[in-house]
Interface confidence: low
């Protein structure tokens, strides 16, 4: 059986596959997925290995019409480096010389300057080029190679291994060499895979059942460390509770060097955030951190300094901590907008079972603002999702020059932010450089400010506007008609009406259904529309909803089904990669993120059209 990294190299014109008959004869044969001699895989960014021989495809020289055969894999050899050229051409790196079928006289696969059909190759059984099944570096754990990547194939006791192995070990632990010749170099590490005993690489907190992996012997950049965690279905460490910090301080107390954690400010326009999307609500900076020096966008935990945090350049090589298992966040279900009939008093605006009101003109210090909101039957607003934030920004009449109190604060416990209404902190969206919590002045309260409504900590004694929020009443004097301009069953957002197509459909069928409704598969123009769509479909039980994006027309170029430019994307991790196909929005934990699927898969979908006679909620005038 093929593992996911292996593929057969297929020429459509001849309907035949590459077959490694011997190291010196690489020819073609009728395709057979069970034939080891036809299986290949990428073993580096640019090397393709024969699974049968554990040797790499290469040439004797970079010249026209020389035979492509198999050689001992050498990551430094220029004669083994391949790259996908436009469409389905495979060429020797840096040259216009292509992997070619040969001809009647020449049965061997050849290197040739021609780029016709005989030089075009796909992964058998797909429409994808060979690079779509590309190489993914596997970072090792423990061992003696500082967390370096596995080198496949590697030689152990004069035998070549193209995968992690337990050879030479009695405990069954899977390992790999990190250079091609383990026998000489003796460099190795354990593989980030599930195997008997791999759980002992993790420390489980008995109180929360969350597991942590301390990789103190590794030396990786922040991005490499994150990839290593993700290869184990984990993420770089996030810390949202004081208990969690205490547990990790104990776990790392015997170490001295810094360890990467998931905290970063890599997002261009927002502030400090955890890579696993946990809220940044607990701060444990080293005095003097975070330093504002440009480029210091990633954070390490310092065992030698009481496990406090320091921001560093992301390219530094350090150890790292991974985290997996139940999230440390309290479970807190946020009702979706459509679940809750919301009725609000005059001058309050409804959203998902709550009512909201901006007090812009009467500036108050945070304590007085809170008192006013509570007198009105509510509290300073808490915000639990990007959709709720989007509602406040785009529907409530929020203005780009506003600076308004919200309920987040760390008055009760320093450096531990909580909502004044007592709801759990499940989401944060800090402005760039925030929270700054400057030492020379107490910044214990939080404001929304700037065009995006992101957050900053502030001294609580500033007189500012504020936003109140209260639970909606079951009956109210005023029912706001929000679906004006849309047909029954469609939902309105700004200029447009949206409808969920409930029939499981292929991309083409979904597109046709929308067209029949005088609509089109949804486009997504910016993060505000994305936030609305995430709230629209994100909590539904189905896994995917088609959007109108695909690269059907031109492989590798994603376009909407209507003539509109693609100016915003919201790809899931590793997307779009080199996979051709049609784009659907995920639901659940990755709610709203875009995945590329095969266009003939069946999913629900979202149709969209212009609303008629569109109106906008009143915008308070200052």
């Amino acid at each position: 059986l093929l593992d996911t990294r292996q593929f057969l190299i297929y020429n459509e014109d001849h309907k035949r596959c590459v077959d490694a008959v011997s190291p010196s004869a690489v020819q073609t044969a009728a395709c057979n997925q069970d034939a080891e001699s036809q299986k290949f895989r990428w073993v580096s960014e640019s090397q393709i290995m024969s699974v049968a021989f554990k040797l790499c495809l290469g040439v004797p020289s970079k010249t026209d019409w020389v035979a492509i055969t198999l050689y001992a894999c050498d990551s430094k050899s220029e004669f083994q480096k391949w790259e996908c050229k436009n469409d389905t051409l495979l060429g020797i790196k840096g040259e216009d010389l292509f992997f070619n079928y040969g001809n009647r006289q020449e049965k061997n696969i050849m290197l040739y300057k021609g780029s016709g059909l005989w030089s075009r190759w796909k992964i058998y059984g797909t429409t994808d080029n060979l690079c779509s099944r590309g190489y993914e570096a596997m970072y090792t754990l423990l061992g003696n190679a500082n967390g370096a990547t596995c080198a496949f194939p590697f030689k152990f006791e004069n035998k070549w291994y193209a995968d992690c192995t337990s050879a030479g070990r009695s405990d069954g632990w899977l390992w790999c060499g990190t250079t091609t010749d383990y026998d000489t170099d003796k460099l190795f590490g354990y593989c980030p895979l599930k195997f008997e005993g791999s759980e002992s690489l993790w420390n489980k907190d008995p109180l929360t059942s969350v597991s942590y992996q301390i990789n103190s012997k590794s030396a990786l950049t922040w991005h490499q460390a994150r990839k290593s965690c993700q290869q184990q279905n984990a993420e770089l460490l996030s810390i949202t509770e004081i208990h969690e910090q205490t547990y990790l301080t104990g776990l790392t107390s015997s170490l001295t060097s810094g360890l990467w954690i998931g905290l970063n400010s890599l997002s261009f326009n927002s502030g400090w955030q955890w890579s696993d999307r946990s809220p940044f609500r607990y701060l444990n900076w080293l005095p003097g951190s975070p330093s504002a020096e440009p480029g210091k966008s990633c954070v390490s935990l310092n065992p030698g300094k009481n496990a406090k945090w320091e921001n560093l350049e992301c390219v530094q090589k350090l150890g790292y901590i991974c985290k997996k298992g139940n999230t440390t966040l309290n479970s807190f279900v946020i009702p979706s907008e459509s679940d809750v009939p919301t009725h609000c008093p005059s001058q309050w605006w409804p959203y998902a079972g709550h009512c909201y009101k901006i007090h812009r003109d009467e500036k108050k210090i945070q304590r007085d603002a809170l008192t006013t909101c509570r007198k009105e039957g509510g509290d300073l607003t808490s915000i639990h999702t990007i959709e709720e934030l989007d509602f406040i920004i785009s529907q409530l009449g929020y203005e780009p020059n506003d600076e308004l109190w919200i309920g987040l604060n760390d008055i009760k416990i320093q450096m531990y932010f909580e909502w004044s209404d007592g709801t759990p902190v499940t989401f944060t969206k800090w402005l760039r450089g925030e929270p700054s919590h400057e030492n020379n002045r107490q910044e214990d309260c939080v404001v929304m400010k700037g065009k995006d409504g992101y957050w900053a900590d502030r001294g609580c004694e500033w007189p500012l506007g504020y936003i109140c929020k209260m639970k909606s009443r079951s009956q109210g004097p005023e029912i706001v008609e929000v679906e004006k301009g849309c047909r029954k069953g469609w939902k309105k957002h700004h200029f447009y009406c949206y409808m969920i197509g409930h029939t499981l459909s292929t991309f083409a069928e979904a597109n046709q259904t929308c067209n029949n409704e005088n609509a089109y598969l949804t486009t997504i123009e910016d993060r505000y529309e994305q936030a609305f769509l995430t709230s629209f479909v994100g909590l539904r039980p189905e896994k995917y909803f088609w959007t109108g994006l695909s690269d059907i027309q031109t492989k590798g170029t994603f376009q909407w089904t209507i003539e509109e430019e693609v100016r915003f994307t919201h790809w899931n991790s590793d997307m779009p990669g080199r996979k051709p196909g049609c784009v659907a929005m995920r639901t659940g934990i990755a709610g709203g993120l875009w995945d590329v699927l095969k266009c003939d898969e069946k999913a629900k979908f979202v149709c969209k059209h212009w609303a008629e006679g569109v109106t906008h909620p009143p915008k308070p005038t200052t």
């Epitope: 065009k451 123009e525 505000y528 003539e563 509109e564 430019e565 100016r567």
Partner: nanobody
Amino acid sequence: QVQLQESGGTLVQPGGSLRLSCAASGSTFSINNMGWYRQAPGKQRELVAGITGGNTHYADSVKGRFTISRDNAKNTMYLQMNGLKPEDTAVYYCNANWGAYWGQGTQVTVSS
């Protein structure tokens, strides 16, 4: 940050024409859609016309009389208003990206 500045509002007689301009500055590359809204005294702010991608849209009350256009090279959006009526009297606001950015507004008064 994006700044929007409207101009062109004035007093005009019924049946007359006017052209409003909205100049965008700052991070204009981030603008995806723009619209003209208006707010008459004591009334709700309403969308008059919108432009997004290559599509335009008009409120029923102005269809056939108003034309929205955009000059990307000049980072400017226009509203050509013909056959003006007294009920078109309002402060006209320029808006971008679903209400993420607003201009200060320009007064249009239609009166004899």
